[in-house]
Interface confidence: low
Amino acid sequence: LPRWRQQWSGSGTTSRFPETVLARCVKYTEVHPEMRHVDCQSVWDAFKGAFISKYPCNITEEDYQPLVKLGTQTVPCNKTLLWSRIKDLAHQFTQVQRDMFTLEDMLLGYLADDLTWCGEFNTFEINYQSCPDWRKDCSNNPVSVFWKTVSRRFAETACGVVHVMLNGSRSKIFDKNSTFGSVEVHNLQPEKVQALEAWVIHGGREDSRDLCQDPTIKELESIISKRNIRFFCKNIYRPDKFLQCVKNPEDSSCLSGI
């Protein structure tokens, strides 16, 4: 008889999860010489150890510390790119601007990007049927705690001028409940970070408003300023042209506003 399994509201673990994590780890360590020392089997063991056999609504940041330790990586000053609700463009940008890094360009972020996982209390099984949903079930689930943990660490290690890409098409351009708003903003270290520069990405082609004057951006400016970090904001009116100009900065059309 099949054993009883807890039913959660969220989708289950991504199929071939262990194989995917291992394969991504191998890919990453081979492309990034500074991480060539990383033993991917140990990384998988630490990842697995964070959630296997544990009640999936009771995961803590402590559970992920062995994994975080193995994946320790530093980003050069001025090269950190945070993002909120605009992941695809942020990743397109760092694919072109190879010396800037989002969390998903780092080993741990790369391993887990777009994946879901959870286990079950007291069994060594991975639950491929369902996993806890952040809203409907619990916030201390394996996926949410993972991203909170690595996002905190990513922000803590940032230095110099930190950039953040924000989605100007959303009603809350800066959302205090996003990972950026609830975790990363509060873990930037004033003694290491001189400034936060927000890039507000416009959605509409004819949208010429100054979204840096948006009330939520003013709220972000207030939070950052109170932490003794300077704040700058830029409108990116034409994201397509912006990417094009990152690729070809000498293009004469790039001398005009983007």
Epitope: A23, V26, K27, Y28, E30, V31, P33
Partner: antibody, heavy 121, light 111 residues
Framework: QLLESGGGLVQPGGSLRLSCAAS????????MSWVRQAPGKGLEWVSD????????HYVDSVKGQFTISRDNSKNTLYLQMNSLRAEDTAVYYC????????????????WGQGTLVTVSS | QSVLTQPPSASGTPGQRVTISCSGS????????VSWYQQLPGTAPKLLIY???QRPSGVPDRFSGSKSGTSASLAISGLRSEDEADYYC???????????FGGGTKLTVLG
Amino acid sequence: QLLESGGGLVQPGGSLRLSCAASGFTFDDYGMSWVRQAPGKGLEWVSDISWNGGKTHYVDSVKGQFTISRDNSKNTLYLQMNSLRAEDTAVYYCARGSLFHDSSGFYFGHWGQGTLVTVSS
Amino acid sequence: QSVLTQPPSASGTPGQRVTISCSGSSSNIGDNYVSWYQQLPGTAPKLLIYRDSQRPSGVPDRFSGSKSGTSASLAISGLRSEDEADYYCQSYDSSLSGSVFGGGTKLTVLG
């Protein structure tokens, strides 16, 4: 599995197109390479191509002469060889690169059995 | 003339330990991984060692790889007659943007 075909006897200045049919793995996860071995000699890397065909590299001696390509929908790797010379005579191996989405470098985990190309008049 | 330098031949008796060296430069071995391949007569090469010292599954632990600076070596302990083959080192060369091989070492098992 990697299975090369298209080799044979060709006159100097002639052309050949080698194919390598891949099976048993996700072809578009891997960079692929061609490596050749002249009779009684050592291995020589010839060319590689990234997982999506976006990047290609060639050994200096075949630049402008050989073209590597791939058709991921057919799980097939190709090598178009033009202006062939006697020194291109070799067994040509198709080799699977390591698992990452950039270039095929670093190591070749699987090899085909090779196809012999003989350039002679 | 190969970019990576290997001795053309090596030999040993059954049970012995032999090592094959491979020297290069900072743009290949110094900065990148080294792999080793075994080629038995009349067959395609087979991967023995990758990422300097890792063994693929199925390769006996008698085979081991190491690297120091711009040189690498393959060690075979407990030599057997079936180890008689050509051995090639290989690395990626950053300045050439391509892979490079050593000239190969013919290993003879005596007796």
